[in-house]
């Protein structure tokens, strides 16, 4: 059985479209599961993995490897 584009699995009922944009950064494995591109995480792979050591409380990142500090915090790790 050949599935339509973006459909996977037994019965072709699993949907996955690879994307690399604001709404997700992932490929699809042979079963239609999302596999996040390097530097991205979360169920939709749209959450950047910040610089290692970046304070989860006082730092954040829009792009992988970044560490942007909240107002009033500074340093490489916003700690």
């Amino acid at each position: 059985v050949t599935c339509d584009d973006y459909y996977y699995g037994f019965g072709c009922n699993k949907f996955c479209r690879p994307r690399d944009d604001f709404f997700g950064h992932y490929a699809c494995d042979q079963n239609g599961n999302k596999t996040c591109m390097e530097g991205w995480m979360g169920p939709e792979c749209n959450r950047a993995i910040c610089r290692q050591g970046c304070s989860p409380k006082h730092g954040s990142c829009k792009l992988p490897g970044d560490c942007r500090c909240q107002y009033g915090w500074q340093g490489l790790y916003c700690d």
Partner: antibody
Framework: QVQLVQSGAEVKKPGSSVKVSCKAS????????MHWVRQAPGQGLEWMGA????????AYAQKFQGRVTLTADKSTSTAYMELSSLRSEDTAVYYC????????????WGQGTLVTVSS | DIQMTQSPSSLSASVGDRVTITCRAS??????LAWYQQKPGKAPKLLIY???TLADDVPSRFSGSGSGTDYTLTISSLQPEDFATYYC?????????FGGGTKLEIK
């Protein structure tokens, strides 16, 4: 279960700004974008933009670029939509909404916030 | 940007009727289409996504079909609670635009 609870109705003067809040619960706030959709009285639905609460990244519909600001407070799991330079045509119900799992479109919606712009 | 054209804009039908609403995209949206139902004073409710997949707790009388640029929502046998406004929406690429809506009224 996923819940999105919005702030109450607002009446604003033309030229002013409004800030609508959307408090999320029942899921990890930083895992999904929060989208905003508006609906003028008797009209259709209009996508305004989205924010990724984890890092603050935003995407806006061109029509609203420069006039709308989306923000998120991770500590309270609350998203905000601020619309500036209000005009009468901005009178609408504003909804926050979230995608479902496996790339669903908008499976979860807030109850809506009516913003009335009147002099 | 992809535009969505929905037709008809309004429709009168009776309980038990079979009803079809169509949506045409200005470009190929590869089945990335959703249908919503909205009742007055309420938020929209997701009915169908990926053109043909029924959302949770949606009755089987609703079905979706289509591909490429042309899509259809069918209600096989109208029930009293189905009288509402229906919207299509693509989510292929931002901006995720909606169709203009179809108001389904009791004949």
């Amino acid at each position: 279960q996923v819940q999105l609870v919005q702030s109450g109705a607002e009446v604003k003067k033309p030229g002013s700004s409004v800030k609508v809040s959307c408090k999320a619960s029942g899921y990890t706030f930083t895992d999904y974008e929060m989208h905003w959709v508006r609906q003028a009285p008797g009209q259709g639905l209009e996508w305004m933009g989205a924010i990724q609460p984890g890092g603050g990244g935003t995407a806006y519909a061109q029509k609203f670029q420069g006039r709308v600001t989306l923000t998120a407070d991770k500590s309270t799991s609350t998203a905000y939509m601020e619309l500036s330079s209000l005009r009468s045509e901005d009178t609408a119900v504003y909804y926050c909404t979230r995608r479902g799992y496996d790339d669903y479109p908008f499976a979860y919606w807030g109850q809506g916030t009516l913003v009335t712009v009147s002099s | 940007d992809i535009q969505m054209t929905q037709s008809p804009s309004s429709l009168s039908a009776s309980v038990g009727d079979r009803v079809t609403i169509t949506c045409r995209a200005s470009g190929n949206i590869h089945n990335y289409l959703a249908w919503y139902q909205q009742k007055p004073g309420k938020a929209p409710k997701l009915l169908i996504y990926n053109a043909k997949t029924l959302a949770d707790d949606v009755p089987s009388r609703f079905s979706g079909s289509g591909s490429g640029t042309d899509y259809t929502l069918t209600i096989s046998s109208l029930q009293p609670e189905d009288f509402a406004t229906y919207y299509c929406q693509h989510f292929w690429s931002a901006p995720w635009t909606f169709g203009g809506g179809t108001k389904l009224e009791i004949k």
